[in-house]
């Protein structure tokens, strides 16, 4: 039975050209995290495997950095980075947990970094 829950930074905004940290946290379960996959819409960005460490997709290597922890840092943000991001936690023995983050990249300096909103 899957008892865990994923907490995320929810809906966040950041300035064009800046950086943002995508963070998810799995709680309320003793399951072992074996791997975390980070996806942007229909693209695999990165994988963190308990045995193998990090793999960053080559096409994102210049702008994606592993960490902190199981999170992911996006750098040199562009307006095209606006959209949904998913953290997919593969755990044993529970199975798979998925968290969602919506990032909006803004042109101006009105971006509110790390703002937390309720995920719909």
């Amino acid at each position: 039975m899957m008892t865990g829950t994923i907490e995320t930074t929810g809906n966040i905004s950041a300035e064009k050209g800046g950086s943002i940290i995508l963070q998810c946290h799995l709680s309320s379960t003793t399951a072992q995290v074996t791997q975390v996959n980070w996806e942007q819409q229909d693209q695999l960005l990165a994988i963190c495997n308990a045995d193998l460490g990090w793999h960053i997709s080559p096409s994102f290597k210049d702008r994606v950095a592993p960490g902190p922890g199981l999170g992911l840092t996006l750098q040199s943000l562009t307006v095209n980075d606006t959209g949904e991001y998913f953290c997919i936690y593969h755990t044993y023995p529970d199975g798979t947990y998925t968290g969602r983050i919506f990032l909006e990249v803004l042109e101006s300096s009105v971006a509110e970094h790390g703002a937390r909103f309720q995920i719909p």
Epitope: Q35, E39, D42, L44, I47, N49, D51, L52, S59, Y92
Partner: antibody, heavy 118, light 107 residues
């Protein structure tokens, strides 16, 4: 250098059993998921079964479920496939493959031929 | 199960030609799509993983694109050693499934 070497194939009668082995070298075997894939003569590739690095997760194709058993011995760097109740349609070359991050099969063995015939 | 439909099933081309092979998934598989090359009597060889990442040691004339349900393998300039059969494979969910293969033959 990563190497995967299958063995144990051969001719067996319908209803018989075989145990395939895949000896791994050149990498930390215990860190990788492993898969078996087969290819019938003149046909395409068919995934058979997979096992996670610590053997916590195992999955089978419907066509072999209940008849085949995948296992691994990380202390011996060896992957196994126990095949029971073999049928003519199981005739194929069987490949073992290393699967980093459970996403792609980056190294394959040379294959071992299993022929099920009376 | 996720069905993978590859087209064409075979094609004839000349050295230097640009070759495109397509693969369609019966449902979205994000970018969990790999391409393999197989020559007669040999094991498959990984070319492209995660839809567009070139496997180490594979020539840059091979490229992959697509996401969701539609994917493409492109060989920019066909070389003599590229005549082989190519397979796509999804790793989005088990059972893992392969396309039926595309045989690239000499014209």
């Amino acid at each position: 250098e990563v190497q995967l070497l299958e063995s144990g194939g051969g001719l067996v009668q319908p209803g018989g059993s075989l145990r395939l082995s895949c000896a791994a070298s050149g990498f930390t075997f215990s860190s990788y998921s492993m898969h078996w894939v087969r290819q019938a003569p003149g046909k395409g590739l068919e995934w058979v079964t997979s096992i996670s690095s610590n053997a916590g997760y195992i999955s089978y194709a419907d066509s072999v479920k209940g008849r085949f058993t995948i296992s691994r011995d990380n202390s011996k760097n060896t992957l196994y496939l126990q095949m029971n109740s073999l049928r003519a349609e199981d005739t194929a070359v069987y490949y073992c493959a290393r699967v980093p991050y459970d996403v792609w099969m980056d190294y394959w063995g040379q294959g071992t031929l299993v022929t099920v015939s009376s | 199960d996720i069905q993978m439909t590859q087209s064409p099933s075979s094609l004839s081309a000349s050295v230097g030609d640009r070759v495109t092979i397509t693969c369609r998934a019966s449902q979205s598989i994000s970018s969990y799509l790999n391409w393999y090359q197989q020559k007669p009597g040999k094991a498959p060889k990984l070319l492209i993983y995660a839809a567009s990442s070139l496997q180490s040691g594979v020539p840059s004339r091979f490229s992959g694109s697509g996401s969701g349900t539609d994917f493409t393998l492109t060989i920019s300039s066909l070389q003599p050693e590229d005549f082989a059969t190519y397979y796509c494979q999804q790793s989005y969910s088990t059972p893992l499934t392969f396309g039926g293969g595309t045989k690239v033959e000499i014209k």
